[in-house]
């Protein structure tokens, strides 16, 4: 896990690669393109990262500052209950859903929304500043 010192206050901060935004202990990439949920996941994995797993309300609120009305795919799926890609349950926020076929999770500035996994949307990847660390 990406834990340890608070990099935002340390003297020599590990940096994020080009195109990635640093916040706290992690690097975030907000896509310019649109893909379906599975291809968004594959994009993040191919860049040694993961589709965004949000750990708490604080992280969610801070990320929403960078979002608009447009939804972005995140690492959240409904597989007998809403779970993040690291296996943890969604337990700090509600997700809006209009249909049982909407089994993938997306986020915009207003919150979480279920969507059909085949819809092309923007996405958000998350990784550690250190290349040799795993996210989960």
């Amino acid at each position: 896990l990406c834990q340890g010192s608070n990099y935002s206050t340390c003297a020599s901060c590990p940096s994020c690669p080009d195109r990635w935004m640093k916040y706290g202990n992690h690097c975030y990439y907000f896509s310019v393109e649109e893909k379906d949920w599975n291809s968004s996941l594959e994009f993040c994995l191919a860049r040694d990262s993961h589709l965004l797993v949000i750990t708490d309300n604080q992280e969610m609120s801070l990320l929403q500052v960078f979002l608009s009305e447009a939804f972005c795919w995140i690492g959240l799926r409904n597989n007998s209950g809403w779970r993040w890609e690291d296996g943890s349950p969604l337990n700090f926020s509600r997700i809006s859903s209009n249909s049982f076929v909407q089994t993938c999770g997306a986020i915009n500035k207003n919150g979480l929304q279920a969507s059909s996994c085949e819809v092309p949307l923007h996405w958000v990847c998350k990784k550690c500043p250190f290349a040799d660390q795993a996210l989960f």
Epitope: S39, A46, D48
Partner: antibody, heavy 119, light 107 residues
Framework: QVQLVESGGGLVKPGGSLRLSCAAS????????MSWIRQTPGKGLEWVAT????????NYPDNVKGRLTISRDNAKNSLYLQMNSLKAEDTAVYYC????????????WGQGTTVTVSS | DIQMTQSPSSLSASVGDRVTITCRAS??????LNWYQQKPGGAPKRLIY???SLDSGVPKRFSGSGSGTDFTLTISSLQSEDFATYYC?????????FGQGTKVEIK
């Protein structure tokens, strides 16, 4: 400028193996995911494998899983495709391609190397 | 997998002609479509990405349009160096899939 040069193609019998190589230059190789695409007269252009920047993750279409293995050596700026249990339908020109960083599929292609599977 | 249907499969045209090639996706791909040009004995070269953005060095006579399922590549005034085969590619959904190609020949 970006250059991708493939090698290792040739004639091989069905069931045989072959290892393709791709030498990359003109860009920071370790910062890009890379892929192999093949082209046949019958099936046209077909994606066959992708590997992550570090090489820790790879991805294949179902029809080649278990037979083709993509790998890379970032210290040598090289990409590889190990091809096992080859079939006649694997006969194609194989292209080494760089993945557009923003996710817009492939942006640069090598000139290709020809693999012929025949008895 | 998403099927990409390209038309026509071939066309004959003269230098100076306006040429239009279409590509239809079997489901919505947003604007996640590229166009490639391939000359005999060569590798494909990306001309247009994200439906309508020209790659650097690509002449402005090439343009792309569309969204959702229907896309178009237009060459406003065909030049001798444009005689080649053109392919569309969708990258919205894995696996990436190509159209079958359109061969542009000299009339």
């Amino acid at each position: 400028q970006v250059q991708l040069v493939e090698s290792g193609g040739g004639l091989v019998k069905p069931g045989g193996s072959l290892r393709l190589s791709c030498a990359a230059s003109g860009f920071t190789f370790r910062n890009y995911a890379m892929s192999w695409i093949r082209q046949t007269p019958g099936k046209g252009l077909e994606w066959v494998a992708t590997i992550s920047e570090s090489g820790n993750y790879n991805n294949y279409p179902d029809n080649v899983k278990g037979r083709l293995t993509i790998s890379r050596d970032n210290a040598k700026n090289s990409l590889y495709l190990q091809m096992n249990s080859l079939k006649a339908e694997d006969t194609a020109v194989y292209y080494c391609v760089r993945d557009d960083w923003e996710g817009r599929a492939m942006d640069y292609w090598g000139q290709g190397t020809t693999v012929t599977v025949s008895s | 997998d998403i099927q990409m249907t390209q038309s026509p499969s071939s066309l004959s045209a003269s230098v100076g002609d306006r040429v239009t090639i279409t590509c239809r996706a079997s489901r919505d791909i947003g604007s996640s479509l590229n166009w490639y040009q391939q000359k005999p004995g060569g590798a494909p070269k990306r001309l247009i990405y994200a439906t309508s953005s020209l790659d650097s060095g690509v002449p402005k006579r090439f343009s792309g349009s569309g969204s959702g399922t229907d896309f178009t590549l237009t060459i406003s005034s065909l030049q001798s160096e444009d005689f080649a085969t053109y392919y569309c590619l969708q990258y919205a959904s894995s696996p990436w899939t190509f159209g079958q190609g359109t061969k542009v020949e000299i009339k």
